[in-house]
Amino acid sequence: YTSTAQPCPYPMAPPNGHVSPVQAKYILKDSFSIFCETGYELLQGHLPLKSFTAVCQKDGSWDRPMPACSIVDCGPPDDLPSGRVEYITGPGVTTYKAVIQYSCEETFYTMKVNDGKYVCEADGFWTSSKGEKSLPVCEPVCGLSARTTGGRIYGGQKAKPGDFPWQVLILGGTTAAGALLYDNWVLTAAHAVYEQKHDASALDIRMGTLKRLSPHYTQAWSEAVFIHEGYTHDAGFDNDIALIKLNNKVVINSNITPICLPRKEAESFMRTDDIGTASGWGLTQRGFLARNLMYVDIPIVDHQKCTAAYEKPPYPRGSVTANMLCAGLESGGKDSCRGDSGGALVFLDSETERWFVGGIVSWGSMNCGEAGQYGVYTKVINYIPWIENIISDF
């Protein structure tokens, strides 16, 4: 007695899939696999399959039901901080070959990394035209100010809203200042935050306000303080530079905008007699801390001339180093002063039409605005590698 096994039904490939191998008929122990087109994946019910092979059984049935080839879905794209996503292929369409466009909030943010266009690829990931799977970055636009030029804080004038949107007020023991970098860093003087280097949370950081005592400001808190390793407290002001990392990003607007760091070409805007602007709530001519944010436009002073001014007692020799720049009038009357420490001395880059930080208010003569003496500022361009390393590492 012999019996022949039943052939199995001819396997019909699911939509967007194909059968392999193709045979005229399939008998006992024959098998076939299903392969999906690019952008589709095997699904049995709701469950994804890595592969699918069915075997013809003795009773003429396949040992597994036919799977489906379902279109790959990249799912809802991640939200972009300070930006948005647009569905270009259709509202909410996130399947294979769908296109989305990321963009950054206008005016105050600019896109880094790529052009923001992403496609849903066969691997199920949103992928940029450069092949990146990670989100683009919306970086704050720096150096925007309501002031278009350096015009004519000691001997200064009142700032208006949006004039110095990078200005940061630092409270914590003494009154000091700083300048916002990006949206979560503050550049300041080492001597202004030295006492808080191990207690960063003690720093009360305020921005987006003109009035020192105003209850209306944006509060920020420090996560960490980084003091330049070459700074020695109570032994001169060389390397008087520090960075404060904020524990949260601040929202950028017309009253809170970071200052730019100097480009390589920045020195061409910081030559002797070029005008820089210092701002702060430090002592004014009346001898009190300013209530309103003040600013002063002051020219850069020849380095040798400044060095000579601080060679005589009571200043120790070598007080003015190559890491410093000086600004002020020989006749005196315009200067930064105590309480302005850590604030930015800014310059307008006429090529980019953005303001950048050239100096950090550091030290000067005991009597602010004194004739023949100048304000001394940390020369920021010397510290770009240090700043970039700290920011990229932390």
Epitope: S70, G75, R84, E86, G90, Q101
Partner: antibody
């Protein structure tokens, strides 16, 4: 609280034009796509048009393509629907509805009547 | 265009019982990871309200007596136990592609 408030409905003659507005509040308007959906008297819901968050992508139902234009002003948190060559079958309550992947918030609607 | 067929067109259910509404799509509206069917409730004189997104995800604030299931082309909305306030018209809607379309609606009446 998310709010969508439509306005601009009324009585229009066949062949006429009308511009509907939808004022949004309570969410970051510029981060979301917005739709217009309509409902004829005693009838079901019909999707009309969609505009992406930044306004660079727009889609329309075939029944209104070439006659209706959807637009938005993100600075004013406002959505618009410019309707031309109106027909009696455009008579409906027009709703604006938020979100890109489903309609999670709806306005109360504005009624447009196209009749001579 | 994808056609969504809802059934029944109307139903009357006793208080505390189960209401089951079906929605059938003319083609699959499921991808490898999502099922692009959403359910809405509309009461007279009011705009629709989202109940369930992606076939089975309850929208926040919606009572747990509402549930959704299904995949591919066949989807179901269940309400159990039905309450007086559930008297309304229920619509399914797909967001698989443009044009987005709605089912014809199911009018639920509580006996």
């Amino acid at each position: 609280d998310v709010q969508l408030v439509e306005s601009g409905g009324g009585l229009v003659q066949p062949g006429g034009s009308r511009k509907l507005s939808c004022a949004a509040s309570g969410f970051t308007f510029s981060n979301f796509g917005i739709h217009w959906v309509r409902q004829a008297p005693e009838k079901g819901l019909e999707w009309v048009a969609y505009i992406s968050s930044g306004g660079s992508a727009v889609f329309y139902a075939d029944t209104v393509k070439g006659r209706f234009t959807i637009s938005r002003d993100n600075s004013k948190n406002t959505l618009f629907l410019q309707m031309t060559s109106l027909r009696s079958e455009d008579t409906a309550i027009y709703y604006c509805a938020k979100s890109d992947r489903y309609f999670d918030y709806w306005g109360q609607g504005t009624t447009l009547t196209v009749s001579s | 265009d994808i056609v969504l067929t809802q059934s029944p067109a109307s139903l009357a259910v006793s208080l505390g019982q189960r209401a089951t509404i079906s929605c059938r799509a003319s083609q699959s509206v499921s991808s490898s990871s999502y099922r692009y069917i959403h359910w809405y409730q509309q009461k007279p004189g009011q705009p629709p309200r989202l109940l369930i997104k992606y076939a089975s995800n309850l929208e926040s604030g919606v009572p747990a007596r509402f549930s959704g299931s299904g995949s591919g082309t066949d989807f179901t909305l269940n309400i159990h136990p039905v309450e007086e306030e559930d008297t309304a018209t229920y619509y399914c809607q797909h967001s698989w592609e443009t044009p987005w379309t709605f089912g014809g609606g199911t009018k639920l009446e509580i006996k």
